[in-house]
Structures are given as C-alpha cells and as structure tokens.
Interface confidence: low
C-alpha cells in the first residue's frame, strides 16, 4: 500500500536501532572514504528527520522518496569533489539517475588499510564505554570495505559481534575467548560478502530473470516438498529483496526480508518441516537461520524426470505455450531431486535443456531429437564432479597452505598479466575451498565447492574489469555467470605471455619478516612464488618446489639467527643465485 511518508513508514517498521544501522550502512557503502564521525552525524540528522515525519506525515519534505532524501544528504557533504572526484558529478543529476550514478561509483577494492582488530583489553574498554558507538564503527568499517554487503545480514553479524564482546569481556582471559570467536565471525562475514556480491553481479549484468532462476534452483533444493507455486512465490520475493539491497534500497530490503521470514514461518506446512528452530528465534537470527536452513527430506515417491520433460508427447507444445514457466518447472523438478548438485550446474543443465528444445522443436521429429537430452547432461555433470575429486584429493595431500600454493601456480600460469596481489588474494580465497568444503559429506561437496569458487571468481572478474590486462580473464568474465568457473578451469598456460625479467629486489627479504604474523608471512612467500612463475611460466612443479623449500629454509635459518640482519644480507643474495640456477 502507498504511504504518505516513506521514511516514516520504514522507521516505524524497522524500529530506531535497525533504522539507524541501515542508514549508516547505506551512507558508508556510497561514500567509502568518509570517517565514522561524518557518517554518524548524517545518520543522526536523518533519524531526527524521520521522527518528525512519524509525528506528522504531512510535515515538510516527509513525502520525498528515500533516494531523494539520502541523495540530498550525501550531496550536501563539504569537499565532495576534493575527496571523491567525479562522483560529485552525480549530484548534478535528478533521481533516479543520481542514485544509479552513486551505484556505479561504488568501489569493490577501495584503497583503505586492512580492518585491524584492536587488542582485547582496548576493545573491551571501548565496548563497555559505549557499545552503540563501538558497533557503529564496526558497521561503518565493514560496509565501506564491502559496498555490496547484504545490509540486514551485516546487522546480524554486528549482533553476533556484540554478543561475543558481552560474553568475553566479562572473562579473565579476554584474548583467548575473543580471538577464535571473532575469527569465526570474520570468516563467515567474508564468505557472505563474496556470495552477496555474486548475487548483485547476476542482477546487474543479467537482470532479475537470471537471479530468479538462481533462486528457484536454490529454493527447490532446500524445500523439495514445496510445490512449484510456493517456490515461485518465494523466489519472486527473494528476488525483490536482493534487488533492493543491490540497488542501495537498504531500508526496503531489510523490511521486505523481515516480511519474507514472517511469511515462511507462518506457512511452514507448505514449505518445509525444518523451519521451526529458525522460526523460534528473534528477527535477525531468524532470517539468517532461514537463509542457511538444512534441506528438507526429499519426497520418497518422486517420478523420474523423463516422464514430463522427455517422454511426454506434449513437450514442444508445453514449451511453446509458456517457455519460462515450462523451463521453470524443469529447473524446479530437477533441482528438488538433486540437492547434491551446485546451483551453477543445475542452471547449466537447464540452459542445455532449453537449447535442445529450441533446436529440436523446430525439427520434423522432435521426440527423436530431444530423446537423448538427459544422456547429454552426463559430461556436464562429470566435469564438476571430477574437479571436486581432483581438488579435494590435492587438498588432503597438501593441506590448506600447500593447496593455495598449487592454485597460485596454476592461476598465475593461466593469467600471468594479472597483478600479483590480486593473484595471491584469489589463490588464498580459492584455496580455502578445501577447508570449507572437502571435509563435508560426499553429497554436499559439489554444491559447496562450485558455488564458492564461482563467488570467488566473480570477485576476480570485478577486480579485472577495473584494469583489464589478460585476454584469458576477459574471455571467461565476459560469458554467463554459470559458465565462468568451467571456463577458468579449462584455461591453460598463456602462451602469449612474455616472461618477466628476473629482478633480484623482488626476492630480497629483510629481518622484519620474522616478526610478522603467520598469515602475513604466508602472503610474502606466496607473492614471491607468483613472481617466480611470472619469471618462468613453464617451470615444473619440481623446480618450484625446490625453490620454495630453499626459501622456507632460508627464512627459518635467518629468523633463528642471533644477528638476523647480517644473515638476511649475506644469505639473501646466495638464495637469489640458487633460485636463478634452479629455474634455468
């Protein structure tokens, strides 16, 4: 229904705390360089204004759209052009073009320092002094580094953060209580970020239809007892929620997500028998829980898929009469039978089925033509299954760090023109798939591996779009989202690449590496590994292993030496010489 004042409506629906959190996230995602204090001031002004509209919906400006109100606030910021350059040009436009312009200027890789966690005592002190400000800082710092983070989910992670601090700051050993718990939240939040970015990419590049197809497949896997009409309703609602969040309409997004959670809990009987535990929780936890709820038990009596989609005499007639609905029912029926497949694979199968019907229904004898379609799925299914087996075997043999290094070598050979920091970040993220997925039961591995890899490769594509340097990467990133992962997997050594000349300074290290945390040490070593491959793209695995073992030995020796600086300055050049010889 239409409301006289949109801002009053959202304030009433969401409540002050969530309203303020979401406005802070919105501003931080649009203007990523502003300080917390600058944004907090704007948030307070917007909240005060919303309260006047709640008191009197007819008050001045209360009837304006949220984009107009928020955009006007952002455009009133002093020194906008000095700090944000051409983003300031957005302010010369009218809505809705102004908001579109802001969206286009979101930076997926802002030049901000890494979000460092203060030490436990300091963190607890500032949390106890002012929990609201502390959580505000958290929302601001995460949102500006992840401009497409799913806003209602970020409120959930902030709530988790709050609960952990409340518990651990009361303990004697705060550090050992906080570290593992906060590490866990950070890991989950980072995965959530890349997954949501993938959804927004799908929406931005291929539109709502593509996202809705993704949602139908995902929901059908999770809720195999729900009928097609129910799945379609949920997919439509979920598409709306995600469209709003990806479009910066965070208040509407959070409000509609809460509505969807409410609907699911009130209609459990027609959706799934697994929802009750989620539905007993408060709002943020409930919506989060529903988003990752376990798959319902598959109905025992499902007929073979061939009956309706291959053997039925009316296949071409049904397809011609309502293409999207018929393909939707195919995707629904196939997905509910295959919780063990990735969504990407299910969408590739649906695409193959569509292409087959397009071709065959125009022929003289369609059934003879499309009769083998299910058999033609086989290679499409085998390819990701082999990928999972090969990579999980390798992960089990090498462990996470070794597996990351294997991927780093592989991807540097595929796209040596890509910057080393991007390659290292991608390989580290891709390598985490082992820890995340290879330990799962067999039937959960494939969906976990492929859908996670797809999300990470989406980030590679986004970073590459800013500065395109590799034709290989451009080729894989230009196709459809579901074809990206197979495209990257199929890439081989880039034969067009002219190897980098050997620069001794790239492989020169100093004693400061010894005091770095383990993660930072790994990144330094992986940077050197990528540079080695760029120097010798056709180096064998053996050669690279020899060099990296030598390098690890060198670091170990010099970091244990009494005079570290002397060790690094004398042994370093020897290492460089040995490396050159080993790779000659």
């Amino acid at each position: 229904e239409a409301h006289k004042s949109e801002i009053a409506h959202r304030y009433n629906d969401l409540g002050e705390q969530h309203f303020k959190g979401l406005v802070l996230i919105a501003f931080s995602q649009y203007l990523q360089k502003c300080s917390y204090d600058e944004h907090a001031k704007l948030v307070q002004e917007v909240t005060d204004f919303a309260k006047t509209c709640v008191a009197d919906e007819s008050a001045a400006n209360c009837d304006k759209s949220l984009h107009t109100l928020f955009g006007d606030k952002l455009c009133a910021i002093p020194n906008l052009r000095e700090n944000y350059g051409e983003l300031a040009d957005c302010c010369t436009k009218q809505e809705p073009e102004r908001n579109e312009c802001f969206l286009q200027h979101k930076d997926d890789n802002p030049s901000l320092p890494p979000f460092e966690r203060p030490e436990a005592e300091a963190m607890c002190t500032s949390f106890k002094e002012n929990p609201t400000t502390f959580m505000g800082h958290y929302l601001h710092e995460v949102a500006r580094r992840h401009p497409y983070f799913y806003a209602p989910e970020l409120l959930y992670y902030a709530e988790q953060y709050n609960e952990i601090l409340t518990q651990c700051c009361a303990e004697a050993d705060k550090e050992s209580c906080l570290t593992p718990k906060l590490d866990g939240v950070k890991e989950k939040a980072l995965v959530s970020s890349v997954r949501q970015r993938m959804k927004c990419s799908s929406m931005q590049k291929f539109g709502e239809r593509a996202f809705k197809a993704w949602a139908v497949a995902r929901l059908s896997q999770t809720f195999p007892n729900a009928d097609f009409a129910e799945i379609t309703k949920l997919a439509t609602d979920l598409t709306k929620v995600n469209k709003e969040c990806c479009h910066g309409d965070l208040l509407e997004c959070a409000d509609d997500r809460a509505e969807l959670a409410k609907y699911m809990c009130e209609n459990q009987a027609t959706i799934s028998s697994k929802l009750q535990t989620c539905c007993d929780k408060p709002l943020l936890k409930k919506a989060h829980c529903l988003s990752e709820v376990e798959h319902d038990t598959m109905p025992a009596d499902l007929p073979a898929i061939a009956a309706d989609f291959v053997e039925d005499q009316e296949v071409c007639k049904n397809y011609a009469e309502a293409k999207d609905v018929f393909l939707g029912t195919f995707l629904y029926e196939y997905s509910r039978r295959h919780p063990d497949y990735s969504v990407s694979l299910l969408l590739r199968l649906a695409k193959k089925y569509e292409a087959t019907l397009e071709k065959c229904c125009a022929e003289a004898n369609p059934p003879a033509c499309y009769g083998t379609v299910l058999a033609e799925f086989q290679p499409l299914v085998e390819e990701p299954k082999n990928l999972v087996k090969t990579n999980c075997d390798l992960y089990e043999k090498l462990g996470e760090y070794g597996f990351q290094n294997a991927i780093l070598v592989r991807y540097t050979q595929k796209a040596p023109q890509v910057s080393t920091p991007t390659l290292v970040e991608a390989a580290r993220n891709l390598g985490r798939v082992g820890t995340k997925c290879c330990t799962l039961p067999e039937d959960q591995r494939l969906p976990c591996v492929e859908d996670y890899l797809s999300a990470i490769l989406n980030r590679v594509c986004l970073l590459h779009e800013k500065t395109p340097v590799s034709e290989h990467v451009t080729k894989c990133c230009s196709g459809s989202l579901v074809e990206r992962r197979p495209c990257f997997s199929a890439l081989t050594v880039d034969e067009t690449y002219v190897p980098k000349e050997f620069k001794a300074e790239t492989f020169t290290f100093h004693s400061d590496i010894c005091t770095l945390p383990e993660k930072e040490k790994q990144i330094k070593k992986q940077t050197a590994l990528a540079e080695l491959v760029k120097h010798k793209p056709k180096a064998t695995a053996e050669q690279l292993k020899t060099v990296m073992d030598d390098f690890a030995q060198f670091l170990d020796t010099c970091c244990k030496a009494a005079d570290k600086d002397t060790c690094f300055s004398t042994e370093g050049p020897n290492l460089v010489t040995r490396c050159k010889d080993a790779l000659a």
Epitope: C265, Q268, A269, T270, S273, Q276, C279, D280
Partner: nanobody, 115 residues
Framework: QVQLQESGGGLVQPGGSLTLSCAAS????????MSWVRQAPGKGPEWVSA????????RYADSVKGRFTISRDNAKKTLYLQMNSLKPEDTAVYYC????????GSQGTQVTVSS
Amino acid sequence: QVQLQESGGGLVQPGGSLTLSCAASGFTFGSFGMSWVRQAPGKGPEWVSAIDSSGADTRYADSVKGRFTISRDNAKKTLYLQMNSLKPEDTAVYYCTIGRSTSRGSQGTQVTVSS
C-alpha cells in the same frame, strides 16, 4: 491447501473433562511439530502445549501442567488434547497450529468451564 479442523469443545463443569481433536489435511502432518493454543475473551493468544512430529517429546505451559495431555495419531492425521480437572480460567477458544506458531489458521473450538 492447508486445513486444520478442531472439534470436541463444549460446556463443562469445573473439575470435568473434555478431549479436543484437530483433523489436519493439505500437508505432511507426520513431518511437523504441532501445538494447541487458546484465546480467552479479550485476551491475546496463549500457547498451551506442543508435541514433536513423532509424538515422543511433549511440552506444556505451567498453567496446564499435570492436567492436560497432548497426543497425536499420524496415521489418522489427528492431534488430540485431553483436558482433565478443568477450571473456569480454562474457558477460551482452543485451536491447533503447526509448529509453535500462535497465529490462528482456523476457527477453533469453544471450551466453556462454568457451574
């Protein structure tokens, strides 16, 4: 279409007994936990009792503990509430719900305890 149909209510004297039934259709009854909820005149809904999908785990509000017994027959797709030692404050419309929901999806059955 999910349907829940309660029956068995009526007028009973304090200390008396009644057994309510709830016939379910339109969903896989045996997969869901169920509850009984009641609403007294002028008051909000109050959760009374719950039972898990298999019937093994039962829960009761403090106000009815020891007097009411919830049970189910999955083959008949029916939920029951055996009410003993009824008190005037048990007067309400009783309805069954899926899970622990207290939102009404049916008409309910009136129980009046009065002398």
